[in-house]
């Protein structure tokens, strides 16, 4: 019997097509992605084949201003749309609260919704009860096949689940549910979840009965051949882990932002194992038409979008210096603001011991693109920060040794006076540099926020302590030549969108004065 | 390499069927959808239907619907297009022509070479 | 069902020219259009796909364009061995339907 999973990850809430490296689409005949795209595809798979299950590993929400707007109804609706038959959920998709999980998505979603090892507590409990599962067994064809979910155990870091939510190891939530299908009668599993490679792989290898795991959080691409795009494959399309028991256990991911669609066969004998295993993530090109009825709905859809962008989110009684003459070589204002709101939106106080878990940001210079002049009535709109921040990115949490840090200081200057991007502008961080010593040699202080403390004050960085850093996508990824944080990040999750992040902020201080403040000096 | 062999030519009388197969080499054969094509004399083309050997899912044309019947053998990787009820208008050559339906290229990217089917009193 | 109209119907040009054919839907086919050339007691042969994409191994004098219901197959400088017949065929819904075909000929 063969089965066919089409599969999505951390579409990101790019509902409309995007350029090649998933930002806003510019020159159309060249986009990828979108909606109407993938629905043109998977419509065209299902006409061929039998048994095909169209599954979404988690982060639906955030990433674009369809998401600031419309806030997950947008997910509910296209999805319905193109009639997904299962989401698992994601980190992101708590990022408005357990609120803004259950009235847009939960109750509006005519597909199941799966996670195992998140355990609802105390009055929320009957509340969200039967909105989301621990699985779901699922008719194709004459057959069924269990679905069964996860969510990264880390969200209560990463998103706002509040206090109601436990999220447990997954292993250890995923064995039982999988158990209760096999005495169900059910010998198809398939583990659909949002905790990243690493644990794919792991719930491959530890969980009992599971025969296919479908990915998503560390945007992996596995492709087995020659890759058609930019992205470049951590390994085979499907990646095959040996289970404990011998099994072997196809895992697959299909990268990031509705850019492919994965696609995998796979055979499975009268008894429910896997004889065999094929597939690749499609590349959704611009030679893929976008499907008109869905393309119309989008149209329709988007007349809001446009009216937001230019709508007050607060005001600014200062101007917002984000010019290059200033953030690619001092403290600017605009660096300060940008950082204030990163560490703003990773507010959680998790534990006593610590105030928040997160006190340090970086920013590169020129990831700052432009101003923002005081004296148009102070107004900021959507469209003013989308000008400062154009690329489409997002400010991550990771992970990283202070030996990595005090190396990506020494980076920022080690060029200096040029104009170049990689001069960091910073956020619970003090820096003295002496430009005339060496490069490599010139941060002569580098004092850090402290983190478990009542009271935050600056400790000089410890080299070889770990620390949280929030910063952007560009830079975890090794941009600007920040080689040595992409090498040597110890963990990496992706966090919000940029804009949305200093939007957000602004809409909740409503007035804002950033200030240059001696986070950067020069002796 | 990818090649469609097609069989012989066929002279069939009005009210007959014909059957005329299409193997395929060099490719995985239940990967592709497979339409059938024919065209008269000096005529344009005009497609029949099409088959997904994978699935056994097949679509017609409305216009032959009831007459027109595809099908395929997937151990010998060969797909049938068997026509009944025939007509002199029937008359044409009838190719076969792969479809990848899971990349990109909307359009036939191989064909047979093309059966030549005479329908003639 | 969805009609192509091609046009025109036959076409004489010489070697060097740069000749163009237009294919009008009678629907909107959201760019799902191919190109097909045919030579006589031949199969067709792709050319484009997707209204614009050139097809593997067609020379680049081969060109197209368009979308919703307008498209268009341009030969920059035609060469001995284009002249042919060429259909443009609607892959949107089916049944797939194709034009009349424009002859190519030798002035």
């Known amino acids: 019997w063969e089965l066919t999973i089409l599969h999505t990850n951390d579409v990101h809430s790019r509902l409309e097509q995007t350029s090649e490296d998933s930002s806003k689409c510019v020159n159309a005949s060249r986009c990828m992605g979108g909606v109407a795209r993938l629905f043109t595809k998977v419509q065209q798979i299902r006409r061929a084949e039998p048994n095909v299950l169209l599954l979404d590993a988690g982060d639906q929400y955030q990433g674009t201003i369809w998401f600031t707007v419309y806030k997950g109804a947008e997910v509910a609706h296209f999805m319905n749309a193109l009639r997904y038959d299962a989401m698992a959920l994601g980190n992101h998709e708590f990022d408005n609260g357990v609120e803004g999980l259950i009235e847009p998505l939960l109750k509006e979603a005519k597909f199941p919704i799966l996670s195992a090892n998140i355990k609802a507590k105390g009055p929320l409990a009957s509340q969200i009860s039967g909105l989301y599962l621990p699985y779901k067994v699922l008719p194709v064809g004459d057959e069924v096949v269990g679905i069964v979910g996860y969510t990264s155990k880390e969200t209560p870091f990463l998103s706002n689940p509040g206090t109601n939510l436990v999220f447990e190891d997954e292993i250890t939530a995923l064995q039982p549910e999988v158990d209760k299908l096999k005495t169900l009668n059910v010998n198809k599993i398939i583990a659909l979840g949002h905790s990243g490679f690493e644990m794919d792989k792991l719930i491959a290898q530890k969980v009992r009965g599971v025969d296919v795991v479908v990915g998503g959080h560390s945007n992996t691409f596995l492709y087995t051949g020659n890759p058609p795009s930019k992205e470049v494959p951590a390994g085979k399309y499907p990646f095959i882990v040996t289970s404990d028991d011998g099994r072997k256990v196809p895992v697959v991911q299909a990268y990031a932002f509705g850019k492919y669609l994965g696609y995998l066969k796979i055979e499975f004998d009268e008894r429910g194992n896997v004889i065999s295993s094929h597939g690749n993530p499609i590349l959704l090109n611009s030679s893929i038409p976008e499907d008109p009825s869905i393309k119309a709905d989008i149209n329709k859809w988007r007349i809001k979008l446009d009216n937001y962008s230019t709508q007050e989110l607060g005001k600014t009684i200062v101007y917002l210096d984000g010019s290059s003459q200033s953030c690619r070589f001092r403290e600017c204002n605009m660096g300060n603001l940008i950082c204030d709101a990163m560490i703003n939106n990773n507010l959680r106080h998790t534990d006593e011991m610590f105030w928040n878990h997160v006190s340090m940001c970086i920013l590169n210079g020129g990831g700052i693109r432009s101003p923002i002049d005081e004296r148009n009535n102070g107004t900021i709109t959507w469209e003013n920060l989308a000008a400062v921040l154009p690329f489409g990115g997002t400010f991550d949490l990771v992970q990283l040794k202070g030996s990595t840090l005090k190396k990506a200081f020494e980076h920022s200057v080690h060029r200096y006076g040029q104009s170049t991007g990689e001069f960091l502008q910073v956020g619970g961080i003090h820096v003295v540099y002496d430009l005339s010593r060496k490069p490599g040699d010139r941060v002569v202080k580098l004092d850090v926020l402290c983190t478990k403390c009542r009271v935050p004050s600056y400790d000089p960085l410890k080299m070889d302590e770990v620390y949280k850093v929030i910063l952007p996508n560009f830079l975890a990824n090794g941009g600007d030549g920040f080689q040595m944080i992409k090498d040597e990040l110890l963990r990496h999750d992706s966090g919000d969108q940029d804009i949305n992040v200093v939007s957000t902020y602004i809409s909740k201080m409503k007035v804002i004065y950033p200030a240059v403040e001696g986070r950067i000096k020069f002796s | 390499q990818v090649q469609l062999v097609q069989s012989g030519a066929e002279v069939k009388k009005p009210g007959a069927s014909v059957k005329v197969s299409c193997k395929a080499s060099g490719y995985t054969f239940t990967s592709y959808g497979l339409s059938w094509v024919r065209q008269a004399t000096g005529q344009g083309l005009e497609w029949m239907g099409e088959?997904?050997?994978?699935?056994?899912?097949?679509y017609y044309n409305e216009k032959f619907k009831g007459r027109v019947t595809m099908t395929r053998n997937t151990s010998i990787s060969t797909a049938y297009m068997e026509l009944s009820s025939l007509r002199s208008e029937d008359t044409a050559v009838y190719y076969c022509a792969r479809y990848d339906y899971l990349g990109s290229s909307y359009g036939f990217d191989y064909w047979g070479a093309g059966t030549t089917v005479t329908v003639s009193s | 069902d969805i009609q192509m109209t091609q046009s025109p119907s036959s076409l004489s040009a010489s070697v060097g020219d740069r000749v163009t054919i237009t294919c009008k839907a009678s629907q909107d086919v959201s760019t799902a259009v191919a190109w097909y050339q045919q030579k006589p007691g031949k199969a067709p042969k792709l050319l484009l796909y997707?209204?614009?994409y050139r097809y593997s191994g067609v020379p680049s004098r081969f060109s197209g364009s368009g979308s919703g219901t307008d498209y268009t197959l341009t030969i920059s400088s035609l060469q001995p061995e284009d002249f042919a017949t060429y259909y443009c065929?609607?892959?949107?819904?089916?049944?797939?339907?194709f034009g009349g075909g424009t002859k190519l000929e030798i002035k």
């Open positions: 088959i997904y050997p994978g699935s056994g899912n097949t």
């Open positions: 065929q609607q892959h949107y819904n089916t049944p797939y339907t």
């Open positions: 997707s209204a614009s």
